[in-house]
Amino acid sequence: MMTGTIETTGNISAKKGGSVILQCHLSSTMAQVTQVNWEQHDHSLLAIRNAELGWHIYPAFKDRVAPGPGLGLTLQSLTMNDTGEYFCTYHTYPDGTYRGRIFLEVLESSVAEHSARFQIP
């Protein structure tokens, strides 16, 4: 039985040219996280974090994606095209798969500051 929940940073905004942290957190379960997949809205892969092997960064993003903090991702040099949904998929044992969603809006305005408030989707 899957008892856990994924908490995410929810809807966030950040400045064009800046960076943002995409973060998910699995709680309320003792399941072991074996792998985390990070993907964009169109199912294109950003990165995979394997508990034993480390990080696999999709080559097209290697100059703009930094691993961490933790199981999260830092997306750098943001463009307007980065606006959209991001998904974290937690592969766990013995629970199975958990999935979280983050919506990132990239703004021209210098007012935009991203919030690190965690939400349960």
Partner: antibody, heavy 127, light 107 residues
Framework: QVQLQESGPGLVKPSQTLSLTCTVS??????????WNWIRQHPGKGLEWIGY???????YYNPSLRSRVTISVDTSKNQFSLKLNSVTAADTAVYYC???????????????????WGQGTTVTVSS | EIVLTQSPDFQSVTPKEKVAITCRAS??????LHWYQQKPDQSPKPLIK???QSFSGVPSRFSGSGSGTDFTLTINSLEAEDAATYYC?????????FGGGTKVEIK
């Protein structure tokens, strides 16, 4: 020497679930530096990668099939399995399992070639 | 996804002739390009990994070259047993992809 052997029904009815198993012999599926793949080949066509599983359960599926695919692993039996839901005639193909190797170091890892393949099993979707 | 385009689709060659098969990637894949040989009713057999590294037991007439987006598999002095379909494969990016294949026929 590691060998892979696919098994499962050769005939599946439309809308049902295709289920195949790959048995690994001559080596452990729990080796850290390998990932385990399913690939298919439609009649007279090229190779299409379906997805992979790592021994500890991590997966990645081809986006074109992911809504219908589940790959699982049973380390106690040295096997990994493919389930493909809601099949149609377009899923008629030869299905292969294959071992891929992994390079890792410095906190990063990379996917290498697929060095060992099963003989393949033909699955026909028909009523 | 990275698209691999092989050319030609088909090649009819006389024994002892030289064969060159090209594989072009839609974006740079570095050296993460591998070649497989598939004979009728058989599973693919690994030939070359990482552009130019031959697998154990592969005859020396098979060689590979290239980098980035353009790669070539060369068969020097083709033999009758080389009649097969050849596939390139990239492991740089997920989803993993294969070229469409090049069928080599012996005249």
């Amino acid at each position: 020497q590691v060998q892979l052997q696919e098994s499962g029904p050769g005939l599946v009815k439309p809308s049902q679930t295709l289920s195949l198993t790959c048995t690994v012999s001559g080596g452990s599926i729990s080796s850290v530096y390998f990932y385990w793949n399913w690939i298919r080949q439609h009649p007279g066509k090229g190779l299409e990668w379906i997805g992979y599983i790592y021994y500890s359960g991590g997966t990645y599926y081809n986006p074109s099939l992911r809504s219908r695919v589940t790959i699982s692993v049973d380390t106690s039996k040295n096997q990994f399995s493919l389930k493909l839901n809601s099949v149609t005639a377009a899923d008629t193909a030869v299905y292969y399992c294959a071992r891929g190797s992994i390079a890792a170091g410095g906190g990063y890892f990379y996917y290498n070639d697929m060095d060992v393949w099963g003989q393949g099993t033909t699955v026909t979707v028909s009523s | 996804e990275i698209v691999l385009t092989q050319s030609p689709d088909f090649q009819s060659v006389t024994p002892k002739e030289k064969v060159a098969i090209t594989c072009r990637a839609s974006q740079s894949i570095g050296s993460s390009l591998h070649w497989y040989q598939q004979k009728p009713d058989q599973s693919p057999k690994p030939l070359i990994k990482y552009v130019s590294q031959s697998f154990s037991g592969v005859p020396s007439r098979f060689s590979g070259s290239g980098s980035g987006t353009d790669f070539t598999l060369t068969i020097n002095s083709l033999e009758a047993e080389d009649a097969a379909t050849y596939y390139c494969h990239q492991s740089s990016s997920l989803p993993l992809t294969f070229g469409g294949g090049t069928k080599v026929e012996i005249k």
